[in-house]
Amino acid sequence: YDFTNCDFQKIEADYLRTISKDLITYMSGTKSTDFNNTVSCSNRPHCLTEIQSLTFNPTPRCASLAKEMFARKTKATLALWCPGYSETQINATQAMKKRRKRKVTTNKCLEQVSQLLGLWRRFIRTLLKKQHHHHHH
């Protein structure tokens, strides 16, 4: 999916209002400084691509993030503010339902959510930079 045409301001507002709190609750006191940031992004569409990948694509060490509250809210936000996003996700959701596993918060999942927090920070920081840039023109 190409995130170029998303409403980035609305996505930022949703993140700050709800998604961030759910991510932090998932971390359960684990601090962002406990892990090194290994995933990055360069612009807003790229950040959303990385956020989607890390949130919804199961990895061998952390398979179940897509069922977490922050993931559900991320999915709803992207569906709401990215034109055509929900249509691209129908098949992926059906495939995911078949792979349900019991919920275990592993250290690798905490590390992955820490990376997500970093990606969201980059997303909003690039947004602020853009707004600041336009403001001066």
Epitope: S20, G29, K31, S32, N37, W120
Partner: antibody, heavy 123, light 112 residues
Framework: QVQLQESGPGLVKPSGTLSLTCAVS?????????WNWVRQPPGKGLQWIGE???????NYNPSLKSRVTISVDMSKNQFSLKLSSVTAADTAVYFC????????????????WGQGILVTVSS | DIVMTQSPLSLPVTPGEPASISCRSS???????????LDWYLQKPGQSPQLLIY???DRASGVPDRFSGSGSGTDFTLKISRVEAEDVGIYYC?????????FGQGTKLEIK
């Protein structure tokens, strides 16, 4: 408005145990905050003692670790500090403080503090 | 433990004039997320400390914009653009990169 209030005895005998409580109002002790203790000997600087999360996870200053216990009482919305085998060097104003995360999971900034309680270690 | 060193330890300032406090850490406070985990606190006489700056340069809620933080890695500065009488007290830097959190010795700002 978030408020923190320290309470406990102002005088403790040498080799005894210092026990303090921090009552939290305007916020839940079970929210995603770390709850901290910091002390300040008279006329000196600040020293971080340790912190607790509502799950019971703790981090202590290694220089005090063998003598410190921090616990949380969710039913009373408060957390406590116990410091054993005290000496005159433990005489200080003891502060409790909240460490609340920002929107990206960063911790390490104490945005609310109690007013502090002076504890004197003397016989 | 990370050692924090402040200078000067005493700072007499004329009201309306700028002031600058330096803080150095024994190791870098720059995390891989590109943020510096350094705070500045002000302890006014007879009061508990109050947060001024966090993450090196972010002003805490309600802090006047005459206060600013800068620096990266091991060298940090707190600047007050125009000192006011209410700014007197002891300023502390604190590293928040890792526990144990550690404070500088403090800089006492007084009015000339």
């Amino acid at each position: 408005q978030v408020q923190l209030q320290e309470s406990g005895p102002g005088l403790v005998k040498p080799s005894g145990t210092l026990s303090l409580t921090c009552a939290v109002s305007g916020d839940s002790i079970s929210s995603d905050n770390w709850w901290n203790w910091v002390r300040q000997p008279p006329g000196k600087g600040l020293q971080w003692i340790g912190e607790i999360f509502h799950s019971g996870r703790t981090n202590y200053n290694p220089s005090l670790k063998s003598r410190v216990t921090i616990s949380v009482d969710m039913s009373k919305n408060q957390f406590s500090l116990k410091l054993s085998s005290v000496t005159a060097a433990d005489t200080a104003v003891y502060f409790c403080a909240r460490d609340a995360p920002n929107d990206y999971g960063d911790y390490g900034f104490f945005d609310y503090w109690g007013q502090g309680i002076l504890v004197t270690v003397s016989s | 433990d990370i050692v924090m060193t402040q200078s000067p330890l005493s700072l007499p300032v004329t009201p309306g004039e700028p002031a600058s406090i330096s803080c150095r850490s024994s190791q870098s406070l720059l995390h891989s997320n590109e943020y510096n985990y350094l705070d500045w606190y002000l302890q006014k006489p007879g009061q508990s400390p109050q947060l001024l700056i966090y993450l090196g340069s972010d002003r805490a809620s309600g802090v006047p914009d005459r206060f600013s933080g800068s620096g990266s890695g091991t060298d940090f500065t707190l600047k007050i653009s125009r000192v006011e009488a209410e700014d007197v007290g002891i300023y502390y830097c604190m590293q928040a990169l890792q526990t144990p959190y550690t404070f500088g010795q403090g800089t006492k700002l007084e009015i000339k």
